[in-house]
Amino acid sequence: MSKGEELFTGVVPILVELDGDVNGHKFSVSGEGEGDATYGKLTLKFICTTGKLPVPWPTLVTTFSYGVQCFSRYPDHMKQHDFFKSAMPEGYVQERTIFFKDDGNYKTRAEVKFEGDTLVNRIELKGIDFKEDGNILGHKLEYNYNSHNVYIMADKQKNGIKVNFKIRHNIEDGSVQLADHYQQNTPIGDGPVLLPDNHYLSTQSALSKDPNEKRDHMVLLEFVTAAGITHGMDELYK
């Protein structure tokens, strides 16, 4: 078990803070909740603290919760491939470019680390080149989320990882908006981290609303499990 992994044996409080600017529309989001890495479970609620969110909530899911991939459940035989937990408590910097097909792009930079006993994800997001009447600024996305696989590979030069995946957002007219994600994670501290073999995270996310909440918000329940690496030969012969 890595030192960082020991921090994830129970339920951990989570705080998320985002400052965003998309085509000049500035906004802030605060989120709170809990993560349980034993089950790969995340429960989070987000509030737009500046009024109405200028972009659809589903376009921010990867920035919020795929940001705290340290809560992914890594099966016993894959624990030596868990970069995310191994970087804790000092944490990691997570940078992404998200290209929305036939529309603009988000660039995000986040620091994910422990502050006391709370896992904090602080994010800056900049969005450019979006069409004012497109699927994103025109709010044409459905309020739901599909399952995805998130592909991870080691980046030995940077002592971190590179991550690629393609999100499929459902559009109200029945079509799909693709969002290509290019991600890089580097540790904040200078302690040893686990550099993984190629594998993937299988994610399932459910979006809901709090019927009593008057503020613009999103409630998110997510399960994430690592997969894609089989047991070694020694395991097969036990």
Epitope: P13, E32, G33, F46
Partner: nanobody, 123 residues
Framework: DVQLVESGGGLVQAGGSLRLSCTAS????????IGWFRQAPGKEREFVGI????????YYADSVKGRFTISRDNAKNTVYLQMNSVKPADAAVYSC??????????????????RGQGTQVTV
Amino acid sequence: DVQLVESGGGLVQAGGSLRLSCTASGLTISTYNIGWFRQAPGKEREFVGIIIRNGDTTYYADSVKGRFTISRDNAKNTVYLQMNSVKPADAAVYSCGATVRAGAAAEQYNSYIFRGQGTQVTV
């Protein structure tokens, strides 16, 4: 569902006692600082008290200190507000909130992301 639900409100005589409950569903209540707030008609919402996560540390507003007690039962995923020696000035809608934030932010209702709907206390 991820929500907080208050219960236990009602009519109480001056000098009497009442116990309010704040029960969480979809959340692990021991993970959060749980604050109690109240709002009387025509008045500002005010901080009543808070119980800090991972323990029994509590803080109270001066107006209720020595009379109100906050406790938690993690097995029932519930936090209680025990109100003793109730005064007419205690009449209000009482609501609870859950936050992972500490310090001054935990005394500000607006900084709470998880909030209950409230329960009426009449004296």
